[in-house]
Interface confidence: medium
């Protein structure tokens, strides 16, 4: 037989299929010009010493073969003895290691079999009603195709699926979308309506992320509040490595997971902007406020579930940075100004109450006064900090209040609201004899003592009702007892106690009269 012809003789090897897993597959035959034809196939397994034979059976029942040697592609003309206008059945037999391996058969009319391309170029992937939609431009001059897909996950083998017939300039396919694992897809096409036409090669892999992006495994740490009233948020991040199918490993566009950081500033609720989203790589500086921090993972299908952490407020207090003056018209606070044109947020809440009860006020942008101070005033009618109780005050500052990451803490301190001088007056003052010339004076702690740093000192006043002489004794704010000595027996005294703050003198308690009994010796 001539090499250019199909040889109508028995092939030069025994006729027996070994049934092994390796062997020839994916046989495709098509017309490549007006009178030339090509068949190509894949061979799976060791290729050394393998000889391939393209077998062909005509409709009459006569069969022939082409010897292809070690090649997996063979061309022939319409004069090679194979009928091109009628249906023929073709398959490949590979002779290797004293055994024959056969490919599946294809039955087709060669003249009408056109070489179809797989989807070429950009395959667009989108989500549609919980399924995956793939779309691509139909290859030139190839409108009208059947399309199949195959897909696999990192832990499952290829599964075949059908996209149905296509008859347009763009083709599309609906495929299953996995919730939590990445998938690799490949597509192939063949001529529509042509009896037994060959499938194209499989397309390049299309890598598709899971519908739900993986949650990042992250930990946050927050540095101490600096002199500038800001603290660095740092991230210990181990983003979940998405397991990828074999064809998607390495560079797999489409499966990328991006992480965003969403900050929610819980303090100062009266500010304009409470949340801001940042690139995870841009770790921000925060004020000393309380925050919720969420890490949002997202892929091409959009954001996934949040993972949220709470960053508590920095409770370090500045005992003297805030001056408060109480006048007849109201109250004014003074503190060292940060810079020109700063907006301040003054936040207060009763001590011991839920953080959700914080109240705040936003100032208009203000410059420092001549003494370098910033101020905030409120009238008694406003009701701000009007109750006679302890308040925790925090002042935040920003040159750009709409940019969440630009707030800083100016100070945190405690303040006793309402008429503090009267409310702080010590009660239950009692006098007990201590010795022949001294007494012990005790009193119940002032309400001001519930407010850290507010009570500066107690002052105990003793008045000699005979001589009208008065002595005053300062007492540490942590003490509620003092010994008055150098007293004279039989003389009437009155004692009073007051509680002073740094900015306010307290109101004296009710006078308590006492005298030391004259000791009569026997």
């Amino acid at each position: 037989c001539r090499t250019s012809e199909c040889c109508f003789q028995d092939p030069p090897y025994p006729d027996a299929d070994s049934g092994s897993a390796s062997g020839p597959r994916d046989l495709r035959c098509y017309r490549i010009s007006s009178d030339r034809y090509e068949c190509s196939w894949q061979y799976e397994g060791p290729t050394a010493g393998v000889s391939h034979f393209l077998r062909c059976c005509l409709s009459s029942g006569r069969c022939c073969y082409f010897a292809a040697g070690s090649a997996t592609r063979l061309q022939f003309s319409d004069q090679a003895g194979v009928s091109v206008l009628y249906t023929v059945t073709l398959w490949v037999e590979s002779w290797a290691r004293n055994q024959t391996e056969k490919s599946p058969e294809v039955t087709l009319q060669l003249y009408n079999s056109v070489k179809y391309e797989p989807p070429l170029g950009d395959i667009k992937v989108s989500k549609l009603a919980g399924q995956l939609r793939m779309e691509w431009e139909t290859p030139d001059n190839q409108v009208g195709a059947e399309v199949q897909f195959r897909h696999r996950t990192p832990s499952s083998p290829w599964k075949l699926g059908d996209c149905g017939p296509q008859d347009d300039d763009t083709e599309s396919c609906l495929c299953p979308l996995e919730m939590n694992v990445a998938q690799e897809f490949q597509l192939r096409r063949r001529q529509l309506g042509s009896q037994g036409s060959s499938w194209s090669k499989w397309s390049s892999p299309v890598c598709v992320p899971p519908e739900n992006p993986p949650q990042p495994q992250v930990r946050f740490s927050v540095e101490q509040l600096g002199q500038d009233g800001r603290r660095r948020l740092t991230l210990k991040e181990q983003p979940t490595q998405l397991e990828l199918p074999e064809g998607c490993q390495g560079l797999a566009p489409g499966t990328e997971v991006t992480y965003r950081l969403q900050l929610h500033m819980l303090s100062c609720p009266c500010k304009a902007k409470a949340t801001r989203t940042l690139h995870l790589g841009k770790m921000p500086y925060l004020s000393g406020a309380a925050y919720n921090v969420a890490v949002i993972s997202s892929n091409q299908f959009g954001p996934g579930l949040n993972q949220t952490w709470h960053i508590p407020a920095d409770t370090h207090t500045e005992p003297v940075a805030l001056n408060i003056s109480v006048g007849t018209n109201g109250t004014t606070m003074y503190w060292p100004a940060r810079a020109q044109s700063m907006t301040y947020c003054i936040e207060w809440q009763p001590v011991g109450q839920d953080g959700g009860l914080a109240t705040c006020s936003l100032t208009a942008p203000q410059d420092p006064d001549p003494a370098g101070m910033a101020t905030y005033s409120w009238s008694r009618e406003s009701g701000a900090m009007g109750q006679e109780k302890c308040y925790y005050i925090t002042i935040f500052a920003s040159a750009h209040p709409e940019k969440l990451t630009l707030w800083s803490t100016v100070l945190s301190t405690y303040h006793f609201g309402g008429n503090a001088s009267a409310a702080g007056t010590p009660h239950h003052v009692s006098v007990k004899n201590h010795s022949l010339d001294s007494v012990s004076v005790d009193w119940a702690p002032s309400l001001l003592s519930t407010c850290p740093g507010v009570l500066k000192e107690y002052v105990v006043r003793c008045r000699d009702e005979d001589s009208k002489q008065v002595s005053e004794h300062p007492v540490q704010p942590t003490e509620t007892q003092v010994t008055l000595s150098g007293l004279r027996a039989g003389v009437a005294y009155t004692v009073q106690v007051r509680a002073d703050t740094a900015w306010l003198r307290g109101v004296w308690s009710q006078p308590q009269r006492f005298s030391i009994e004259v000791q009569v010796s026997d």
Partner: antibody, heavy 121, light 107 residues
Framework: QVQLVESGGGVVQPGRSLRLSCAAS????????MSWVRQAPGKGLEWVAG????????EYADSVKGRFTISRDNSKNTLYLQMNSLRAEDTAVYYC??????????????WGRGTLVTVSS | AIQMTQSPSSLSASVGDRVTITCRAS??????LAWYQQKPGKAPKLLIY???SLQSGVPSRFSGSGSGTDFTLTISSLQPEDFATYYC?????????FGQGTKVEIK
């Protein structure tokens, strides 16, 4: 591929209103912040307004605050700019631009071709 | 609002030249700066974001640097398709603002 197509421009008298639309395709619209940027004839670029991915946050340039409203319909993949009380100085090509993030705090990675708004009596 | 000042306003250069455009912010903007290229009758195109990150698909002859208030766009070897107007833009604070533009013309 990503496509942004503006429409709704035209000639309008001062004081009147106009609504611009921007149809987005080729990407997951609900995952991106969007903005409007304008360019007066022969002049530079001016950012007009921006909106976050969900529509919850909006921002405006001082020159349009109180007159223009940016909004989005995520079900229609469409961005809008409602322009009221138009002035001659609002005459410009208006571009729709995508932010490469959920919010609008970054540059703009995709732009439409623009639609011309002429405010003239 | 933050003022963005570009210099020069225009420049003439030849193919193969190294071109540098600067942008100065009226206050610190960290690295929240983008550079765009615009050709007549076309929409702007993002070249650089975060002051120095090259946008995907942009040739590596474009580079950006700077932080705070002073920023630079460099074209290492000018190509015929690079003749255009270039804008910087800050996105540190609202309202976002652009520079007035630098026109790069053929010498």
């Amino acid at each position: 591929q990503v496509q942004l197509v503006e429409s709704g421009g035209g000639v309008v008298q001062p004081g009147r209103s106009l609504r611009l639309s921007c149809a987005a395709s080729g990407f997951t619209f609900t995952s991106y912040g969007m903005s409007w940027v304008r360019q007066a004839p022969g002049k530079g670029l001016e950012w007009v307004a921006g909106i976050s991915y969900s529509g919850s946050d909006t921002e405006y340039a001082d020159s349009v605050k109180g007159r223009f409203t940016i909004s989005r319909d995520n079900s229609k993949n469409t961005l809008y700019l409602q322009m009221n009380s138009l002035r001659a100085e609002d005459t410009a090509v208006y571009y729709c631009a995508r932010s490469p993030d959920y919010i609008i705090d970054y540059g703009f990675d995709y732009w439409g071709r623009g639609t011309l708004v002429t405010v003239s009596s | 609002a933050i003022q963005m000042t570009q210099s020069p306003s225009s420049l003439s250069a030849s193919v193969g030249d190294r071109v540098t455009i600067t942008c100065r912010a009226s206050q610190g903007i960290s690295s929240d700066l983008a550079w765009y290229q615009q050709k007549p009758g076309k929409a702007p195109k993002l070249l650089i974001y975060d002051a120095s990150s090259l946008q995907s698909g942009v040739p590596s002859r474009f580079s950006g640097s700077g932080s705070g208030t002073d920023f630079t766009l460099t074209i290492s070897s000018l190509q015929p398709e690079d003749f255009a107007t270039y804008y910087c833009q800050q996105y540190w604070i609202y309202p976002f603002t652009f520079g007035q533009g630098t026109k790069v013309e053929i010498k």
